[in-house]
């Protein structure tokens, strides 16, 4: 019997390389059984995840699965960074793993690390 | 059920290149990592690196970088790898290994591909 | 890179009679989420690895309950309680909490 408590799915240590100036949509995949309950995004500024109160979110609703989207129109340079969804569920918080956008300045596009440059940096080690 | 199938063994010279496929039913890659493991004869086990397929996302252990590559087509629910100038060191038996959603635990295994590297 | 350090190299061991393998790691692996991606593997002969045991004591299914994973930080440990023919093979633990991801050297349990 499959669990009627809310998951997030967002993978554990995931991460996005994106250009600034570019449109992206940060998706929370969300399982709920009746009720879809409330969530939101936050960004992790050290050991807090501060709540993104003024940004635009919005739903997508598929077969299975729901999506709360975090929507970036567009990606601006101080958008790098871990990013966290949460959910509360009867009376719970459940917070997903944190997921990291690496953004690139099209500015210096031409010095663009490649996706595995960025990957071993030392500040990735998940500590 | 899940299955991860892999392509079948491989004889090839070195300073060749030769690319390993995994296909996998029962789960949609896109929710998983798909990782690579070299085992060469009689040895331990030694993680390559990993994919994301939802984003193409990559991650490897240094040591492989420049001589491991790997890719991943959601459409057809399959990950590759791609090793490089190829020398009897990479003689191995290569697994790929499947996260369910992407938890990073190693939950599904392939049955493992044997690459020999010989002139 | 985290260096994972199993002992002994081969045990050998009486069917029936327990057997307890060693993992220490060059680094505490309890991860900021609190949990420790530390796991067992089993490796029989000719065979791929079967996971036996992930986040250091949670069993997988299927795996009988004579397994038990325990430790926290750095130092860990698998116990057999009653080793049964099955269980011959090699073990390797596997930490998961930094890049790169690493494996012991493994453990051949074998009988006397």
């Known amino acids: 019997k499959e669990s009627c408590d809310v998951q997030l799915y967002i993978k554990r240590q995931s991460e996005h390389s994106i250009l600034a100036g570019d449109p992206f949509e940060l998706e929370c995949p969300v399982k709920y059984c009746a009720n879809r309950p409330h969530v939101t995004w936050c960004k992790l500024n050290g050991t807090t995840c501060v709540k993104l109160e003024d940004r635009q979110t919005s739903w997508k609703e598929e077969k299975n699965i729901s999506f709360f989207i975090l929507h970036f129109e567009p990606v601006l340079p101080n958008d790098n960074g871990s990013y966290r969804c949460s959910a509360n569920f009867q009376s719970n918080l459940i917070e997903s793993h944190s997921t990291t956008l690496y953004v690139t300045d099209v500015k210096s596009a031409s010095e663009r690390p490649s996706k595995d440059e960025m990957a071993s940096r030392p500040w990735l080690l998940y500590r | 059920e899940v299955q991860l199938q892999q392509s079948g063994a491989e004889l090839v010279k070195p300073g060749a290149s030769v690319k390993l496929s995994c296909t996998v039913s029962?789960?949609?890659?896109?929710?998983?990592?798909i990782h690579w493991v070299k085992q060469r004869p009689e040895q331990g086990l030694e993680w390559i690196g990993r994919?994301?397929?939802?984003?193409?996302?990559?991650k490897y252990d240094p040591k492989f970088r420049g001589k491991a590559t790997i890719t991943a087509d959601a459409s057809s629910n399959t990950a590759a790898l791609q090793v490089s100038s190829l020398t009897s060191e990479d003689t191995a038996v290569y697994f790929c290994?499947?996260?369910?959603?992407?938890?990073?635990?190693?939950?599904?295994w392939g049955h493992g591909t044997t690459l020999t590297v010989s002139s | 890179e985290v260096v994972m350090t199993q002992t002994p190299l081969t045990l050998s061991v009486t069917i029936g009679q327990s057997a307890s393998i060693s993992c220490k790691s060059s680094?505490?692996?309890?991860?900021?989420?609190?949990?420790?991606?530390l796991n067992w593997f089993l490796q029989r002969p000719g065979q791929s690895p079967k996971r036996l045991m992930h986040?250091?004591?949670k069993l997988d299914s299927g795996v009988p309950d004579r397994f038990t994973g325990s430790g926290s930080g750095t130092d860990f440990t698998l116990k057999i309680s009653g080793v049964e023919a099955e269980d011959l093979g090699v073990y390797y633990c596997w930490q998961g909490t930094y890049f790169p991801y690493t494996f012991g050297g493994g453990t051949k349990l074998e009988t006397k």
């Open positions: 029962g789960f949609n890659i896109k929710d998983s990592y």
């Open positions: 290994v499947g996260d369910h959603y992407g938890s990073s635990l190693f939950d599904y």
């Open positions: 986040l250091v004591s």
């Open positions: 994919i994301d397929p939802a984003n193409g996302n990559t």
């Open positions: 680094q505490s692996l309890l991860d900021s989420d609190g949990k420790t991606y």
